[in-house]
Interface confidence: low
Amino acid sequence: KHKCFRKELEENETLESIMNTAESEEELKKYFYYLEGSK
């Protein structure tokens, strides 16, 4: 599966859940940057 990065968390989604399901370090970095930038 492939996650597109986005600027907001889905319902019940957390950085931890993303971390647990992300398939690569690259994907984690993409998520992290956009989530932090949206705060």
Partner: antibody, heavy 122, light 113 residues
Framework: QVQLVQSGGGLVQPGGSLRLSCAAS????????MSWVRQAPGKGLEWVSA????????YYADSVRGRFTISRDNSKNTLYLQMNSLRAEDTAIYYC???????????????WGRGTLVTVSS | DIQMTQSPDSLAVSLGERATINCKSS????????????LAWYQQKPGQPPKLLIY???TRESGVPDRFSGSGSGTDFTLTISSLQAEDVAVYYC?????????FGQGTKVEIK
């Protein structure tokens, strides 16, 4: 105030075990990833291990994988490093360090403990 | 693993003068999708733990004097102290957090000339 207070260092024989502790205060401990970083006497910094805010995800340097275990008790605001099968080359000051963020990423450290000396010698 | 190499190993600078420390990574720490460099700088004084100065290669940590600045991208980075003060005598380390294991440079000792 915001701080990390370390304990548990000391002298241990090669092959022995030791547990380091790092008590956090002044911030919501469970919200942040934590790491251990060590510094051999007169040498540079070496990252050892990291753990996510929930404790579900752990990461290790190759030099300690299988011998060291990082853990945390968020109810006690405390980080641990269990060190087994210690070697002379593990002799160092061990620092606990706080990541500014809750996941493993991005991996830099904005708050450090004062360090605790671990000496492995017979 | 990504290797970090600093230069010089030590430097002596007169008070009020500029100090420049270089850091080179063995592979790029620039993540193209967000155009961020995964690099931090720390200051360590004798008998003390390291102190975060700069992250994302150029973002100054809160409370750090503006005489400290970071620059560079990809594999080549620089920490600049624009006007050296006596309290800046320390060892400075770069660190990459692009991938685990996180790795540090060997350190650069800054002294007063």
């Amino acid at each position: 105030q915001v701080q990390l207070v370390q304990s548990g260092g000391g002298l241990v024989q090669p092959g022995g075990s030791l547990r380091l502790s790092c008590a956090a205060s002044g911030f919501t401990f469970s919200n942040y990833a934590m790491s251990w970083v060590r510094q051999a006497p007169g040498k540079g910094l070496e990252w050892v291990s990291a753990i996510s805010g929930s404790g579900d995800n752990t990461y290790y340097a190759d030099s300690v994988r299988g011998r060291f275990t990082i853990s945390r008790d968020n109810s006690k605001n405390t980080l641990y490093l269990q060190m087994n099968s210690l070697r002379a080359e593990d002799t160092a000051i061990y620092y606990c360090a706080k990541d500014p963020h809750s996941s493993r990423w991005p991996g830099f450290f904005d708050l450090w403990g004062r360090g605790t000396l671990v000496t492995v010698s017979s | 693993d990504i290797q970090m190499t600093q230069s010089p190993d030590s430097l002596a600078v007169s008070l009020g003068e500029r100090a420049t420390i270089n850091c080179k990574s063995s592979q790029s720490v620039l993540y193209s999708s967000n155009n961020q460099n995964y690099l931090a700088w720390y200051q360590q004084k004798p008998g003390q733990p390291p102190k975060l100065l700069i992250y994302w290669a150029s973002t100054r940590e809160s409370g750090v004097p503006d005489r400290f600045s970071g620059s560079g991208s990809g594999t080549d980075f620089t920490l600049t102290i624009s006007s050296l003060q006596a309290e800046d005598v320390a060892v400075y380390y770069c660190q990459q957090y692009y991938s685990t294991p996180y790795t540090f440079g060997q350190g650069t000792k800054v002294e007063i000339k």
